[in-house]
């Protein structure tokens, strides 16, 4: 998809001129507010095991293995985001691939990703109303990482 | 600043009707709010060593530590992306935090991120020409992960 930028349109509702043609158009407005995923992701995942595989994708070969959980919102760009869910509280031993090593913690790496939400434009009504896209930061867990526990000074 | 996505406009150059107003557009005023890497950048960016710290950000406490390398493109949204660069070929021992363990590999986790590139609109010329934003997938390394080496069947 290609987007076109219009100058002088940093505040709604000015970003939704009504003199355009009638097909639905999507508009972007910007705000820096951040959004959290629907619910916190726990360590204990359903039926996936806490083990580091010797083949398969990187998330299953990691000694801090994780699964991906889909977060879909039809009014967001991107519609599909994936949250990493750690399968173990501690890191798996490199030797065995199964026993956990209490010296290491398996923790999620979080990132505030830029997303856009589709919202009805202010003052727009009717069948062919246009939409504004609102820029937000959305917290996603990208992966799980094996770290040495933090030592407080 | 607001952008418009036009339905049925997945291919350039159809996204740039020329009947808009003429004022110069200040591209990307709105993206100057730069996105930080998932973890704050450490001050000692120059001399990163292959060791797992007991404090500091997650990327330095990881047993597959990494640094972030800035990738800036003023014609892209977001302008700033950060690539994880692994500091060790193998994972660092959980015991010592410094010696490497040949049983584990420290490897980058790649992700195809959606970005937008500014392109001159087809048929647009002159001082006040408009721009189109073109949606692309861009490969970024998010983090480094400690994995068990792949065993070939």
């Amino acid at each position: 998809v290609s987007l076109r930028i219009q100058e002088g349109c940093s505040h709604l509702p000015s970003c939704c001129p009504s003199k355009e043609q009638e097909p639905p158009e999507e508009w972007l407005k910007w705000s820096s507010a951040s959004v959290s995923p629907p619910e916190p992701l726990s360590h204990t995942h359903h039926a996936e095991s806490c083990r580091a595989s010797k083949d398969g994708p990187l998330n299953s070969r990691a000694i801090s293995p994780w699964s991906y959980e889909l977060d879909r919102d039809l009014n967001r760009v991107p519609q599909d985001l994936y949250h990493a869910r750690c399968l173990c509280p501690h890191c798996v031993s490199l030797q065995t691939g199964s026993h956990m090593d209490p010296l290491g913690n398996s923790v999620p790496l979080y990132h505030n990703q830029t997303v856009f939400y589709r919202r009805p434009c202010h003052g727009e009504e009717g069948t062919h109303r246009r939409y504004c896209l609102e820029r937000r930061l959305y917290r996603v867990s990208l992966a799980c990482v094996c770290v040495r526990p933090r030592v407080m000074a | 600043v607001s952008l418009r996505i036009q339905e049925g406009c997945s291919h350039l150059p159809s996204c740039c009707p020329s009947k808009e107003q003429e004022p110069p557009e200040e591209w990307l005023k709105w993206s100057s709010a730069s996105v930080s890497p998932p973890e704050p950048l450490s001050h000692t960016h120059h001399a990163e060593s292959c060791r797992a710290s007991k404090d500091g950000p997650l990327n330095s406490r990881a047993i597959s530590p990494w640094s972030y390398e800035l990738d800036r493109d003023l014609n892209r949204v977001p302008q700033d992306l950060y690539h994880a660069r692994c500091l060790c070929p193998h994972c660092v021992s959980l015991q010592t935090g410094s010696h490497m363990d040949p049983l584990g590999n420290s490897v980058p986790l790649y992700h195809n991120q959606t970005v937008f590139y500014r392109r001159p609109c087809h048929g647009e010329e002159g001082t006040h020409r408009r721009y189109c934003l073109e949606r692309r997938l861009y490969r970024v390394s998010l983090a480094c992960v400690c994995v068990r080496p792949r065993v070939m069947a």
């Epitope: 999507e26 994708p57 959980e69 889909l70 039809l74 760009v77 519609q79 | 997945s10």
Partner: antibody, heavy 125, light 107 residues
Framework: EVQLQQSGPELVKPGGSVRISCKAS????????MNWVKQSHGKNLEWIGL????????SHKQRFMGKATLTVDKSSSTAYMELLSLTSEDSAVYYC??????????????????WGQGTSVTVSS | DIQMTQTTSSLSASLGDRVTISCSAS??????LNWYQQKPDGTIKLLIY???TLHSGVPSRFSGSGSGTDYSLTISNLEPEDIATYYC?????????FGGGTKLEIK
């Protein structure tokens, strides 16, 4: 031509587990999410969950977490669903269904556009 | 979860009739609604997505309409091969949910 070929009927003892397969052909397997649906007593359809074959990402209906494990084998373009700790309540026909996406990017619409023929699972001692 | 209700569980009609099957959602689903046909042999096919868009290969006698919480599927000129059970399904929010089905029979 898009086709989803499911494995044959299963008779399983209570407490046991079963793995159903769904072999895809006629399209790029990693480009489409795969859904799994349960039909009990030849009537109601109930969504179990979905898996993205590209990254293994899943979403489950809450009550099937711990009951259904979804996996894929990209090399053979096959999706699997393993059902655990089976009881008579799990006796049903299970369908795999490809999820197509429609409409202009980036706002897609989603529908289960191609379905497998169904796999009957009977739990009985 | 969003509840989908098909109040009519079975329906009898004559060949050539115009038949309407209704479906309601427990909340506004913004037209994010699909219709499926299940034949007596268990085969399931997508008929309509996004309330009113016909899937490829579906005869034009099928049409869909609705908005908000209320939706319907219409068969304008009933044919023998339309004997089946019809299900609505919302994709507004995960988990996806289906209506209970409406079984269409010939009088």
């Amino acid at each position: 031509e898009v086709q989803l070929q499911q494995s044959g009927p299963e008779l399983v003892k209570p407490g046991g587990s079963v793995r159903i397969s769904c072999k895809a052909s006629g399209y790029s397997f990693t480009g489409y999410t795969m859904n799994w649906v349960k039909q009990s007593h030849g009537k109601n359809l109930e969504w179990i969950g979905l898996i993205n074959p590209d990254n293994g990402g899943t979403s489950h209906k809450q009550r099937f977490m711990g009951k259904a494990t979804l996996t894929v084998d990209k090399s053979s373009s096959t999706a699997y669903m393993e059902l655990l700790s089976l009881t008579s309540e799990d006796s049903a026909v299970y369908y795999c269904a490809r999820e197509g996406y429609y409409g202009p990017s980036p706002f897609h619409h989603y529908a289960m556009d191609y379905w497998g023929q169904g796999t009957s699972v009977t739990v009985s001692s | 979860d969003i509840q989908m209700t098909q109040t009519t569980s079975s329906l009898s009609a004559s060949l050539g009739d115009r038949v309407t099957i209704s479906c309601s959602a427990s909340q506004d689903i913004s037209n994010y609604l699909n219709w499926y046909q299940q034949k007596p042999d268990g085969t399931i096919k997508l008929l309509i997505y996004y309330t009113s868009t016909l899937h490829s290969g579906v005869p034009s006698r099928f049409s869909g309409s609705g908005s908000g919480t209320d939706y319907s599927l219409t068969i304008s000129n009933l044919e023998p091969e339309d004997i089946a059970t019809y299900y609505c399904q919302q994709y507004s929010k995960l988990p996806y949910t289906f209506g209970g089905g409406t079984k269409l029979e010939i009088k």
